[in-house]
Interface confidence: medium
Amino acid sequence: VEVQVSEDPVVALVDTDATLRCSFSPEPGFSLAQLNLIWQLTDTKQLVHSFTEGRDQGSAYSNRTALFPDLLVQGNASLRLQRVRVTDEGSYTCFVSIQDFDSAAVSLQVAAPYSKPSMTLEPNKDLRPGNMVTITCSSYQGYPEAEVFWKDGQGVPLTGNVTTSQMANERGLFDVHSVLRVVLGANGTYSCLVRNPVLQQDAHGSVTITGQPLTF
């Protein structure tokens, strides 16, 4: 028996359902009584879901997995993972045994889009050209880690005096805070771009300083 899975990682958004595709080619006369199907975490060998002795043995992994029972006889051994969490990310191995056995691994990449950045300025009043200001760009609840880019009003990258930190919350999602320290010109726009490298999603924020008032 030959097992086939998708070579590319499966990308799933947090809190959505994902299908880890796995298939095999049943011989003529194949019946489910002959099938032993096991899904497990590749690294730890933890059992995720199994079908043995002619029946679905159910989820061994937080009760969020399911097979496609009506499609098993056609060779579809795919696994449905519901309400995906960050902690589900990783490699899953599909083992199929009929008379002989084969296995293959499929990777699950979890992702979550970042919120539109909020911009704060310190100090935020009595600003004059030549003043040193701190601009903070904050974006929330994304996954995986963000890449953060700063640009001035002419689109020139600002790389000096930038400090970016990322904090994982209880769900494993990241809040990103990027701080730019810059000397004010006569006026200017400062933009921050927060990029999710898996989703290729960009979230933009900017602040324009033209004396008073400030524009966000």
Epitope: E145, Q166, P197
Partner: antibody
Framework: DVQLVESGGGVVRPGESLTLSCAAS????????VSWVRQAPGEGLEWVSG???????YYADSVKGRFTISRDNSNNTLYLQMNSLRAEDTAVYYC??????????????WGLGTLVTVSS | EVVLTQSPGTLTLSPGERATLSCRAS??????LAWYQQKPGQAPRLLIY???TRATGIPARFSGSGSGTEFTLTINSLQSEDFAVYYC??????????FGGGTKVEIK
């Protein structure tokens, strides 16, 4: 079996450059976050730089602008390019694998380390 | 940056005794804390992660507890191979990942 083997350490003068390598086996390097952690003689552990599975790079403030982390997925190797070396960079440099692509950033596997000595 | 402070710096005990090592974080890191053991001339070895979970192959005499800012590694009935330096590490707020300064457990 997961294995990490560092190489490229040696003795250099202040201001010079050095590139460290970490050959990984038993796992795919772009499926995990991998870091460089150093330990100065008789001192504690200091995280230096890391790269996530998705390719996002991180640096400690003490090396930002001087060190560059990279990886070659085709030969499953991690690198640390160290420029403008200083005496305080003298340490054993360990390559360490996180147990996840990103966020669970504790280190479940470590190499044996390679010694970098910066001295005039 | 989250600063981790380990105490005591050195713990002098006899085999069979219980070792209690402390790690304090400068702000809450929930339960995102790991413990490592390091012997002279060797790389660190993961003991505990997520504050309480023992890594693969780590004996049951090692246990972790705590949350927020106060964490403890307990070694029940010290064996000769347990005399080493122990480091805590946080992975909640980063970069940078930060380590404590270490506690040396030495034989009395």
């Amino acid at each position: 079996d997961v294995q990490l083997v560092e190489s490229g350490g040696g003795v250099v003068r202040p201001g010079e450059s050095l590139t460290l390598s970490c050959a990984a086996s038993g796992f795919t390097i772009n499926s995990y976050a991998v870091s460089w952690v150093r330990q100065a003689p008789g001192e504690g552990l200091e995280w230096v730089s890391g790269i996530s599975g998705s390719g996002v790079r991180y640096y400690a403030d003490s090396v930002k602008g001087r060190f560059t982390i990279s990886r070659d997925n085709s030969n499953n190797t991690l690198y640390l390019q160290m420029n403008s070396l200083r005496a305080e960079d003298t340490a054993v440099y360990y390559c360490a694998r996180s147990n996840k692509v990103t966020w669970n950033n504790f280190f479940d596997y470590w190499g044996l380390g390679t010694l970098v000595t910066v001295s005039s | 940056e989250v600063v981790l402070t380990q105490s005591p710096g050195t713990l002098t005990l006899s085999p069979g005794e219980r070792a209690t090592l402390s790690c304090r974080a400068s702000r809450s890191i929930l339960t995102s804390l790991a413990w490592y053991q390091q012997k002279p001339g060797q790389a660190p070895r993961l003991l505990i992660y997520n504050t309480v979970t023992r890594a693969t192959g780590i004996p049951a005499r090692f246990s972790g507890s705590g949350s927020g800012t106060e964490f403890t590694l307990t070694i029940n009935s010290l064996q000769s191979e347990d005399f080493a330096v122990y480091y805590c590490q946080q992975y909640y707020d980063w970069p940078p990942l930060t380590f404590g300064g270490g506690t040396k457990v030495e034989i009395k």
